[in-house]
Interface confidence: low
């Protein structure tokens, strides 16, 4: 037999909170358990689902979980079925709602001295206890002629008077919690002695020296007082007007007339109605002086024939907002057609050359009128006046290529060299008429040039080939002073180019012929073995038929190249002692010696007391310090060549002698001892 060892039980539950209906079964066979709600099977959801045999509620819902739950256990083999006891929830909840008018049927029917009943639509279980509020202040039974039942949701005001006017709200609480009205009710009961607005003044905009009228009327029983004030709270009456409102008139019906308005009259005017009872009613209206600012300038516009273009006219700031229209040749543009106005825009559809000219945007309001012209040019495709021609330009001289075109507007001309855009620099210059100037023609300027002339309507282009007429020149020019090493072989090259290949020959500057051991081989002067007599001035002559000849003068010096007799050695010195770095060089002309230490040249005139460079080139450093350590370079140079050699200098601390060491013990490394 199937036995329920845990039966579900009816229980209190809170709306939206967790709950559990327990059910546990004992049976000889395998049983499956399911739940019924009011006789229908319960489907699992995320909110309500079976947990083992029990039914779990993640959040109790007063609508979906009301009814009778039953746990059912069934043995599918034997068909035996058992049902638990019924269980239900006593769900506690509270739900906010609005304050509504119950009596009379509509707000329009609320009159002084009638009964008014308000209903608080807060519901809940158990039945809530209600509290009423007017303008946030709690109301209690019998207070100010209102009957309140704290057990009921109704608030009755009998009779209702102006003193009951205000914002009514309610709150309620029960075992679940508290809620307040979601929407409150404003009760407005007119008191005939209170001033009520019949006609409110409106803001006005007037032009300077024009007149302005404000209308204002109140009603009350007895009739109310009416007073006008301006800005600084100055009253305006027909008897006492402020100095700046001399031209103000207050009419019997409450209207205020201002004539010949000035800027100082602009501002806020207050119309105040005061009944026999109740607060003053203040109405405000502003008098604005009409104004209009200047319009921004238009940039000239260039359009192409056949296209559709628009020009937007930004209206000037003004009060009231200015109206805008376009004119052309003194005639206002229509709102449709080929050339028309659309909103603030001038629209030119399928532009023709005849559309060019001045168009005017007008803006106007009470304060006056403004206008601004825009000049519209209809672009044409450029035509040729002079195309670039194939040209021969002389090397080293300025060269010109012409590209003269005409169009509307003035065309822009750009030049390309070998398909690369030419940007103006020190060699290239494009004149305003489109002509290209090559300031100093070079051999590699011989190529294709293309000019493109453009307007927004289109472009034309043409190209020309430039041939450079090369000048007769040395390539490269020989060095004017050159050295040759005594008793060695030497060569002095000379080459030149021109429109025709030039012939090249050497001669001595004094006109004498070259010695037999010196040969001139296609422009290269060759010395088999340099002697002292080979020194002197020589001339290289390059010539061809069409261009004549050019000369280059070279002074040759014969020298014994530098060698070092003595080179500085790696040196280690005790701190405080003297270091000697020896360096001697020989050569002809006699070389000069310079020293470089720690990557800077040692200037003999600025060495200070610790350093000295001897005539023979040796460097001495007295009282050496650790910072003197480093590489020292001896540089020997004359007018023909330069050589250098370097050695490191180490500065070390002098060791303290140990007892075991005799007075004559040698230092642990090779030293200079001074």
């Amino acid at each position: 037999a199937i036995v329920f060892i845990k039966q579900p039980s009816s229980q209190d539950a809170l709306q939206g909170r967790r709950a559990l209906l327990r059910c546990e079964v004992e049976a000889p066979g395998l049983v499956h358990v399911y739940w019924l709600l009011d006789g229908a099977p319960v489907q699992d959801t995320e909110r309500r689902f079976t947990q083992g045999s029990s039914l779990s509620f993640a959040a109790v819902d007063r609508l979906q979980d009301s009814g009778t739950f039953q746990c059912v256990a069934r043995d599918d083999v034997t068909g035996e079925e058992a049902r638990s006891a019924n269980a239900s929830f006593n769900i506690k909840w509270i739900e906010a709602g609005p304050v509504v008018l119950k009596h009379p049927a509509s707000e329009a029917e609320i009159q002084p001295q009638t009964q008014v009943t308000l209903r608080c639509h807060i519901d809940g279980h158990p039945r809530p206890t209600y509290q009423w509020f007017r303008d946030g202040t709690p109301l209690s039974d019998g207070q100010s002629n209102n009957t309140v039942s704290s057990k009921e949701r109704n608030l009755t005001l009998r009779p209702a008077g102006p003193e009951h006017s205000g914002l009514y709200s309610c709150c309620a609480h029960n075992a679940f919690g508290q809620a307040c009205s979601s929407q409150n009710f404003t009760l407005s009961i007119a008191d005939e002695s209170f001033a009520r607005v019949v006609l409110a003044p409106q803001d006005v905009i007037v032009a300077r020296n024009e007149e302005a009228m404000f209308h204002c009327q109140f009603s009350a029983q007895p009739p109310p007082n009416l007073q006008w004030l301006f800005e600084d709270e100055t009253p305006i009456t027909n008897r006492s007007r402020p100095p700046h409102l001399r031209r103000a008139t207050v009419f019997a019906n409450g209207s205020l007339l201002l004539t010949q308005v000035r800027p100082r009259n602009a501002g806020v005017y207050r119309c105040i109605g005061q009944g026999q009872r109740g607060p003053p009613v203040i109405l405000e209206a502003t008098l604005h002086l009409a104004e209009i600012e200047d319009m921004p300038l238009f940039e000239p516009r260039v359009f192409t024939a056949g296209s559709e273009e628009r020009v937007t006219c930004l209206p000037p700031k003004g009060l009231p907002e200015p109206s805008v229209w376009w004119e052309h040749a003194g005639v206002r543009l229509p709102t449709h057609g080929r050339v028309y106005q659309k909103g603030h825009e001038l629209v030119l559809a399928s532009i023709a050359e005849s559309d060019a000219g001045v168009y005017t945007c007008h803006a106007a309001n009470l304060a006056g009128q403004r206008r601004q012209d825009v000049n519209i040019t209809v672009a044409t495709v450029p035509t040729w006046l002079k195309k670039p021609q194939d040209s021969q330009l002389e090397e080293g001289k300025p060269g010109y290529l012409h590209c003269l075109t005409q169009a509307t507007p003035k065309p822009t001309v750009v030049w390309y060299r070998n398909q690369m855009l030419i940007s103006e620099d020190s060699r290239f210059e494009v004149f305003k008429n489109g002509t290209l100037r090559i300031n100093n023609v070079e051999v590699y300027d011989g190529t294709w040039y293309r000019c493109v002339s453009s307007t927004p309507a289109g472009s034309i282009e043409a190209q020309a080939r430039v041939q450079v007429l090369e000048k007769l020149k040395f390539t490269p020019p020989p060095q004017p002073q050159q050295c040759m090493e005594f008793d060695k072989e030497a060569t002095v090259p000379c080459s030149a180019t021109g429109r025709e290949k030039p012939t090249i020959k050497w001669e001595r500057a004094d006109g004498s012929s070259l010695p037999e051991w010196v040969t001139d081989n296609a422009g290269t002067l060759h010395f088999a073995r340099v002697t002292r007599d080979d020194a002197g001035n020589y001339t290289c002559i390059a010539s061809n038929g069409p261009q004549g000849q050019i000369r280059a003068h070279v002074q040759l010096t014969v020298a014994v190249f530098i060698t070092f007799k003595v080179e500085p050695e790696r040196t280690t010195v005790y701190q405080g002692h003297t270091a000697l770095l020896q360096c001697e060089a020989q050569g002809d002309p006699k070389p000069l010696i310079q020293w470089k230490g720690k990557d800077r040249i040692l200037d003999p005139t600025k060495l200070g007391p610790r350093m000295h460079i001897f005539q023979n080139g040796s460097l001495v450093i007295h009282d050496v310090a650790p910072e003197d350590s480093g590489r020292y370079t001896c540089i020997a140079g004359n007018s023909c060549n330069i050589k250098h050699t370097e050695a490191p200098l180490y500065v070390v601390d002098k060791p303290v002698p140990e007892e075991s060491e005799g007075p004559g013990s040698p230092p642990p490394y090779k030293m200079i001892q001074t």
Epitope: E308, E309, T312, L314, P315, E321, G343, H344, E345
Partner: antibody
């Protein structure tokens, strides 16, 4: 129906230069419209960067002017954005958009491309 | 530049309710030069309103715009489920054109 499509790298290094291209289809870039770039940092509002007309005329937002170059290639029916000296503050979705003829509001937009500035 | 401020930042309403979105400019904007856009997550903005009150092509008549000077309003009369997204206003009367920071309309 005009369509706009942004393309370019999704990642740019700090101090580098962003290069994006917007391809226009279904219409000519030489129409009377201006073509704009607009960006939107993640979770934030929209910022107009600048615009170009097919003639090459440009207008830029003064706050970005020193770093922005917008160019147009009529032959390819596309326009491009270059934004230099990129920082993390330039991380955003970049949109290209078309101005309604003559007015500075946008009637067509690209779908946008996210550009992240990170080393 | 003109600073454009939208309020509220977030608006919580139920489907079928009326939405009122506000847009305020730091200087007066000609009424011809204010636009509203709608932006769905992961998509580009879409033009809703231009010239303060003119609906763009294909925009339903539940969207309407009004205002002048510095204060402008977008009204959605009956909210549909697809309307719960972000809305931006943009002034284009003064360069540079500027956008508001957006108003998110969410389901209550």
């Amino acid at each position: 129906q005009v369509q706009l499509q942004e393309s370019g790298p999704g990642l740019v290094k700090p101090s580098g230069t962003l290069s994006l291209t917007c391809a226009v289809s279904g219409g000519s870039i030489s129409s009377i419209n201006w073509w704009s770039w607009v960006r939107q940092p993640p979770g934030k509002g929209l910022e107009w960067i600048g615009e170009i007309y097919h003639s090459g005329s440009t207008n830029y937002n003064p706050s970005l002017k020193s770093r922005v170059t917008i160019s147009v290639d009529k032959s390819k029916n596309q326009f491009s954005l270059k934004l230099s000296s990129m920082t993390a503050a330039d991380t955003a979705v970049y949109y290209c958009a078309r101005d309604e003829s003559g007015y500075d509001y946008f009637d067509y937009w690209g779908q946008g491309t996210l550009v992240t500035v990170s080393s | 530049e003109i600073v454009v401020t939208q309020s509220p930042a977030t608006l919580s309403l139920s489907p079928g309710e009326r939405a009122t979105l506000s847009c305020r400019a730091s200087q007066s904007v000609s009424s011809s030069y204010l636009a509203w856009y709608q932006q769905k997550p992961g998509q580009a903005p879409r033009l809703l309103i231009y010239g303060t009150s003119s609906r763009a092509t294909g925009i339903p008549d539940r969207f309407s715009g009004s205002g002048s000077g510095t204060d402008f309003t977008l009204i959605i009369t009956r909210l549909e489920p697809e309307d719960f997204v972000v809305y931006y206003c943009q002034q284009y009367g003064t360069s540079p054109r500027t956008f508001g920071q957006g108003t998110k309309v969410e389901i209550k």
